[in-house]
């Protein structure tokens, strides 16, 4: 059962797993949610009645019954992890804590103009977990405007004390605001020879990489596969760090794989969701329960529905035993990973899907794209919306993309002459315009947010957000697309598609069925040669065939240029402008979304 409210002056008795320090009860709840075993917590706020050494303690707790006895205690705030809830969860914490000094290893000290600059520095430093900034009112003259970057083994402070005229806060890496590069490749036959900070068991290098990504101290990893010669090290995932943030030495070793934490682009990759099944593989761990199940999929469902279950092993039924049902072993461990992985015993293993909600919805795999043809099929582009105006009569105005449960990203030029959001309707999950009848459900628009530097499409800043009046319930036919990571600026996308109901040629009409076209990206240098009379800025991105023939056109504006990278779709561009449609040597020009990620997050995450 999901309990979101905090219990004031209440302490949960017993069940302690560990104690960490957090600046607020709200953040204690987030830490509990991300901890592999924590189901409940008790936080101690600052209070004259409490011993100052206990202020800001966050005690993480577990219970077989999923609850614990409650005791009244002043300044104690208790609550439950969000593991029991079905809503989306984020580790992003933008709060600034005034007059609090969050203690950790101070590894970098420099002058900063503001707390915001200090936080940005922390976000763009590979080691930084949190910071403390001494304001210009700080009593000690030589410490004024000093920005201390800090890290700890756990990612949370080792202590928190009251200190006048300082402010503290956390890195915004988990808010998708880091400019650090994301190295997504996994390097075969490679061992990174740097210091290990931890080790866990993992079934493959991808799970090892995801574990590294959400481990606070892990910057890169080495995984020994099941064919690794040393038996005791098979399936071992070594979590590593180094002073420089990069591996100092890489050694060639067969059957080992290495890679990097994807911390700074974790909003666009699955991190907690290990959805694969591992055949002929047994996961060992503490046994929670043994249940009969018809299949390994059914076993995974049982594990997902049992809040304490972290992983499972299913042993298929022997011929006619037990009505064809096999045994489903529900398991857990102290760190959420199997304590040992065995092969060749006939089991099928996997992980709970309960933690998938801790990943961005946009990372969910969608149904395979239909290759060939120009007409889309239902569910192929579930982020694509059709934006209608009702004035003077109802018609398709522009495309747009779902990027959050209340947000559509589109082009600013779509709103020329639109006086009020009241005349707009957003339809999602639509394949054919003919599906839209008077009684078709739509989302009303609460607010149109146009970039304040927008003047006209050709001069850039052609980007706008629509805030919906109600939230979108994600389904197979309507779900968000990931924003590109700032750390992926150097990625060369090779699988890009433009979609929309726009014209198929310059003099045409809006199409009934959603059209799609695969279009290669063109360098800005090349694009500039094709548009001598315009300035193609780095905030624009171009796509098109040299010979023309495929392009976006009138009515496609505001729609997505979607590119698939590492199995995840990213909103790389917004259809903006071009000379004619599909003309030879006239690529389409799109708003380069990666350059507006800060702007999008600022507007959509505003309190």
């Amino acid at each position: 059962e999901c309990v979101t409210q905090l219990l004031k002056d209440t302490c949960f008795e017993g069940g302690d797993i560990t104690t960490v320090f957090t600046p607020s009860a709200k953040y204690c709840q987030v830490v509990c949610t991300y901890h592999p075993r924590c189901l409940l917590f008790t936080f101690t706020a600052e209070s004259p009645s409490e011993d100052p050494t206990r202020w800001f303690t966050c005690v993480l707790k577990d219970s077989v019954t999923e609850t614990l006895p409650r005791v009244n205690r002043t300044a104690a705030i208790s609550g439950y992890s969000f593991k029991q809830c079905s809503h989306q969860i984020s580790a992003c914490n933008k709060d600034i804590y005034v007059d609090l000094d969050m203690k950790g290893i101070n590894y970098n000290s420099s002058v900063a103009k503001s707390a915001q600059e200090c936080q940005e520095r922390c976000t763009d430093d590979v080691h930084c977990h949190f910071f403390t900034y001494a304001t210009r009112q700080f009593p000690s003259l030589e410490h004024r405007n000093i920005c201390l970057l800090k890290h700890t083994q756990t990612g949370t402070p080792t202590r928190i004390t009251k200190l006048d005229k300082v402010v503290s806060g956390f890195s915004l890496k988990s808010c998708a605001l880091s400019n650090l590069a994301c190295i997504r490749d996994i390097f075969p036959n490679t061992v990174f020879a740097d210091s290990n900070i931890d080790s866990v068991m993992a079934p493959d290098a991808f799970v090892c990489g995801r574990i590294c990504t959400h481990h606070p101290g892990c910057l890169f990893f080495t995984f020994f596969s099941q064919e690794w010669p040393k038996e005791s090290q098979r399936n071992l995932c070594l979590l590593k760090t180094s002073e420089s943030g990069l591996p100092s030495t890489r050694i060639k070793k067969s059957k080992a794989l290495s890679g990097f934490s994807l911390q700074s682009c974790r909003h666009s990759i699955p991190v907690f969701c290990h959805s694969s099944f591992y055949h002929d593989t047994d996961f060992l761990g503490e046994e929670l329960d043994i249940v009969a199940a018809k299949s390994h999929e059914a076993c995974q469902k049982l594990c997902t529905n049992a809040v304490r279950c972290q992983f499972f092993t299913y042993t298929p039924a022997q011929a006619s035993c037990n009505e064809g049902k096999g045994k489903c072993y529900l398991k857990l461990s102290s760190n959420g990973s199997p304590t040992k992985i065995l092969h060749g015993r006939g089991g099928i293993s996997g992980y709970t899907l309960r933690l998938c909600k801790m990943d961005n919805e946009c990372t969910t795999k969608i149904k395979p794209r239909i290759v060939g043809g120009t007409a889309s099929v239902r569910g192929e582009w579930p982020w694509q919306v059709t934006l209608h105006t009702t004035s003077p009569t109802q018609r398709h105005l522009c495309g747009g993309s779902i990027i959050g449960n209340q947000w559509i990203l589109t082009a600013a030029h779509c709103f020329y002459g639109v006086e009020s959001p009241k005349i707009l309707r957003v339809y999602s999950g639509i394949l054919n315009q003919s599906e839209i009848k008077e009684d078709t459900s739509f989302f009303g628009v609460q607010e149109i947010i146009i970039h304040d530097q927008y003047k006209m499409a050709e001069s850039g800043y052609d980007i706008a957000l629509l805030k919906l009046e109600t939230t979108v319930n994600y389904t197979d036919s309507q779900r968000p697309i990931c924003l590109p990571s700032k750390g992926d600026r150097n990625v060369i996308y090779t699988d890009c598609w433009v979609t929309g109901w726009g014209y198929r040629k310059l003099r045409d009409k809006i199409q009934n069925t959603l059209q799609k076209a695969k279009i290669p990206l063109v360098t800005n240098e090349e694009c500039q040669k094709r548009y001598r009379g315009h300035k193609i800025t780095h905030k624009m991105i171009c796509a098109g065939y040299r010979e023309g023939g495929k392009d976006a056109c009138k009515g496609d504006s505001g729609g997505p240029l979607s590119c698939k990278h590492n199995e995840v779709w990213h909103l790389v561009g917004i259809t903006s402008w071009g000379e004619g449609c599909a003309q030879r040597e006239r690529p389409g020009v799109y708003t380069n979304v990666v350059e507006y990620v800060d702007w999008i997050l600022e507007k959509t995450q505003a309190v």
Epitope: I183, D185, V491
Partner: antibody, heavy 121, light 107 residues
Framework: EVQLLESGGGLVQPGGSLRLSCAAS????????MHWVRQAPGKGLEWVSS????????DYADSVKGRFTISRDNSKNTLYLQMNSLRAEDTAVYYC??????????????WGQGTMVTVSS | DIQMTQSPLSLSASVGDRVTITCRAS??????LNWYQQKPGKAPKLLIY???SLQSGVPSRFSGSGSGTDFTLTISSLQPEDFATYYC??????????FGQGTKVEI
Amino acid sequence: EVQLLESGGGLVQPGGSLRLSCAASGFTFSPYWMHWVRQAPGKGLEWVSSIYSSGGWTDYADSVKGRFTISRDNSKNTLYLQMNSLRAEDTAVYYCAREGVAGTNDAFDIWGQGTMVTVSS
Amino acid sequence: DIQMTQSPLSLSASVGDRVTITCRASQSISSYLNWYQQKPGKAPKLLIYAASSLQSGVPSRFSGSGSGTDFTLTISSLQPEDFATYYCQQSYSTPPWTFGQGTKVEI
């Protein structure tokens, strides 16, 4: 034809700076690790620096660390080496080289023709 | 860092001779060893990678062998165009990528 073409070498005074470029053609540049290797007159080959395909990972020989910076622009198919605080011992022919596909051929399979850098007062 | 030691540093041979150059690593490098040929005023050219794999376009008279610490480059029948300097290089533990001092094959 697959090729690498270096430019930017020349005569420079000690303490001075120089920027070398290496233009790649005939292959898709972006997936490959790229390297700079130098050869002092009459001497053997010395590895200088390397850069990962997307540019987020660089390595340097101890002899140039803190003075040289490797970078790349995948949209221009070009590799760079910014050399600052140059010393007489940096005098050499500088080659750019492509590292072959990981796991199959990790050797430097394509080399440029080299560009001469002379550091002298 | 892994040190690479070549021997001999120079050798004289005639056309048609069988020539052997050895390279020793200061520690085991498995089979991650490459051989390059360099002619005066030219860039090095890859001959052999992974100790014994012949790079495409390289004549079959060139061959490589060895693993661990000791490696050999053999030219079965020396041709006029083979007079050059030969370098071994390890790619086992990097950075740095280290080269041998070179072996000059003279007429």
